[in-house]
């Protein structure tokens, strides 16, 4: 960071390495919770038209797919992987692709994925063979 750009103490809006290089924030689909028609498919597009700049450079893209007796929803957000989301740790935050993993939630089917390439939560992947065989 050049000297004229102040670095505030304990500020999480800027991430730098030892050489002063600055980390750019992630670009993620960010439509919060929307009704979805994504069901029984190997992968789905988010159908979210909003690509937002994540507020903090350490945040990653997240997608949450939920199905209950009444509806299906897809949530797309930015989130800090150091913090749980919906009470779950974002284990796959460094992945370039958003590969859905099922989580135990009573009364619904709940899948979540996280990833760290631009707009990676636009394409959510459920396919088991992708999970196990794709080196990406």
């Amino acid at each position: 960071i050049p000297p004229h750009v102040q670095k505030s103490v304990n500020n999480d809006m800027i991430v730098t390495d030892n050489n002063g290089a600055v980390k750019f924030p992630q670009l993620c689909k960010f439509c919060d919770v929307r009704f979805s028609t994504c069901d029984n498919q190997k992968s789905c597009m988010s159908n979210c038209s909003i690509t937002s700049i994540c507020e903090k450079p350490q945040e990653v893209c997240v997608a949450v797919w939920r199905k209950n007796d009444e509806n299906i929803t897809l949530e797309t957000v930015c989130h800090d992987p150091k913090l749980p989301y919906h009470d779950f740790i974002l284990e796959d935050a460094a992945s370039p692709k958003c590969i859905m993993k099922e989580k135990k939630k009573p009364g619904e089917t709940f899948f979540m994925c996280s990833c760290s390439s631009d707009e990676c939560n636009d394409n959510i992947i459920f396919s088991e063979e992708y999970n196990t065989s794709n080196p990406d």
């Epitope: 050049p2 390495d17 290089a21 600055v22 980390k23 750019f24």
Partner: nanobody, 124 residues
Framework: EVQLLESGGGLVQPGGSLRLSCAAS???????RMWWVRQAPGKGLEWVS?????????YYARSVAGRFTISRDNSKNTLYLQMNSLRAEDTAVYYC?????????????????WGQGTLVTVSS
């Protein structure tokens, strides 16, 4: 030598508008995603808006979406930020920065990626 020179800041009343410019030189402008970044007094950097080198795809922070518009003129090597419906919380020094698309970090040069900034003050 890479240079980014911001201009267009000033004092404006709440609800008013300003247009910032960033004149770029010393690098191939059309190879870089360009950003507007701001720093309010005593606060950290906030990443406001970005635009792709070609195709003019744009991105905004949620705090400014719908009020700010980023654009670029590749023939003039210039980046713009049109700011409407300004609020007191938009008061900050505004910088432009360049990014190779897909690269997560700036280069290690502390001076390569930042101009001196232009001050925007929103006050009645």
């Amino acid at each position: 030598e890479v240079q980014l020179l911001e201009s267009g800041g000033g004092l404006v009343q709440p609800g008013g508008s300003l247009r910032l410019s960033c004149a770029a030189s010393g690098f191939t402008f059309t190879e870089y995603r360009m950003w507007w970044v701001r720093q309010a007094p005593g606060k950290g950097l906030e990443w406001v808006s970005a635009i792709e080198p070609i195709g003019n795809r744009t991105y905004y922070a949620r705090s400014v979406a719908g009020r700010f518009t980023i654009s670029r003129d590749n023939s003039k090597n210039t980046l713009y930020l049109q700011m409407n419906s300004l609020r007191a919380e938009d008061t900050a020094v505004y910088y432009c920065a360049k990014q190779i698309p897909g690269r997560k970090w700036t280069a290690n040069s502390r001076f390569d990626y930042w101009g001196q900034g232009t001050l925007v003050t929103v006050s009645s």
